[in-house]
Amino acid sequence: TLNSVLNSNAIKNLPPPLGGAAGHPGSAVSAAPGILYPGGNKYQTIDNYQPYPCAEDEECGTDEYCASPTRGGDAGVQICLACRKRRKRCMRHAMCCPGNYCKNGICVSSDQNHFRGEIEETITESFGNDHSTLDGYSRRTTLSSKMYHTKGQEGSVCLRSSDCASGLCCARHFWSKICKPVLKEGQVCTKHRRKGSHGLEIFQRCYCGEGLSCRIQKDHHQASNSSRLHTCQRH
């Protein structure tokens, strides 16, 4: 399966050079540190770009987010970009590296207020991509600091999927995000065909579980594009 992370023919992407920021050349794609060639033990260092197309943050790694590589670039292409470190500008939580969240347009540490027992956070969801403004829909939410120590259970408020327990993902629910179950075989899933369409969901579904992919249900192949039902199916 794709879960064999230590496969000898896998290559891992690294973040762009320090100081790289979304929307500027040099941060558009990630550099690869090296390749372990199959059947051999030669580790060859390379320094090139590895764009990984995406439509939403969940398709990228936990240390990445999905966005257009340049502000003035092709609006139809989004790729995985390295997450933003503390004190860097942001427009949504997924842009900030794990352990941080987006507050007032800046990535701040999730740990800042642990000693106080809870943190206050403004969840700002703008229903578009990185080019949209920060007005969106804002509401004040109190998050227990415990969520940063123990994985959130179903229904717990979260910032990203890594905040949730195994078998759960962090998905939008109204204008907050909560831990929801990863989809099982046969369950209805959402297939994002149009760029940015995932931003319109106020009840977002998780992705399909391992070994499953979101495909058109066989008896719905003849249906019109708008009414096609997608379900999680075995590869």
Epitope: T1, L2, N3, V5, N7, N9, A10, I11, K12, N13, L14, S30, Q50, Y52, P53, C54, A55, D57, E58, E59, C60, G61, T62, D63, E64, G76, V77, Q78, C80, R160, S161, S162, C169, K191, H192, R193, K195, Y207, C208, E210, L212, S213, C214, R215, H235
Partner: nanobody, 122 residues
Framework: EVQLVESGGGLVQPGGSLRLSCAAS????????MGWFRQAPGKEREFVAA??????YYADSVKGRFTISADNSKNTAYLQMNSLKPEDTAVYYC?????????????????WGQGTLVTVSS
């Protein structure tokens, strides 16, 4: 484990065309990206193009000449290469995206095929 098998490589004259194919198994084909990379003799492996349902992406050196596509029903990715130049000579590798955070990875990454040789020469 992902299995990738490339085909379609060969010898072609400058200005000619080739179409590479990559058959994938064990890959969530219609969800995660497929890509093509190349490695010329004595050089580092470089990105050529990638495609997913959200769109395609090309290296500047091949824009307008190469087209990447995928046929989900056949679990196959293609690289149509037109107006080939001698500097396009390389081993071309198919690559499959692994699904990122859905599988717990900190970085989205690719897994590789064994490669197919493309030689552009008169």
């Amino acid at each position: 484990e992902v299995q990738l098998v490339e085909s379609g490589g060969g010898l072609v004259q400058p200005g000619g065309s080739l179409r590479l194919s990559c058959a994938a198994s064990g890959h969530t084909f219609n969800t995660y990206p497929m890509g093509w990379f190349r490695q010329a003799p004595g050089k580092e492996r470089e990105f050529v193009a990638a495609v997913s349902y959200s769109g395609s992406y090309y290296a500047d050196s091949v824009k307008g000449r190469f087209t990447i596509s995928a046929d989900n029903s056949k679990n196959t990715a293609y690289l149509q290469m037109n107006s080939l130049k001698p500097e396009d000579t390389a081993v071309y590798y198919c690559a499959a995206g692994n699904g990122g955070r859905a599988y717990g990875y900190s970085r989205a990454r690719y897994e590789w095929g064994q490669g197919t040789l493309v030689t552009v020469s008169s």
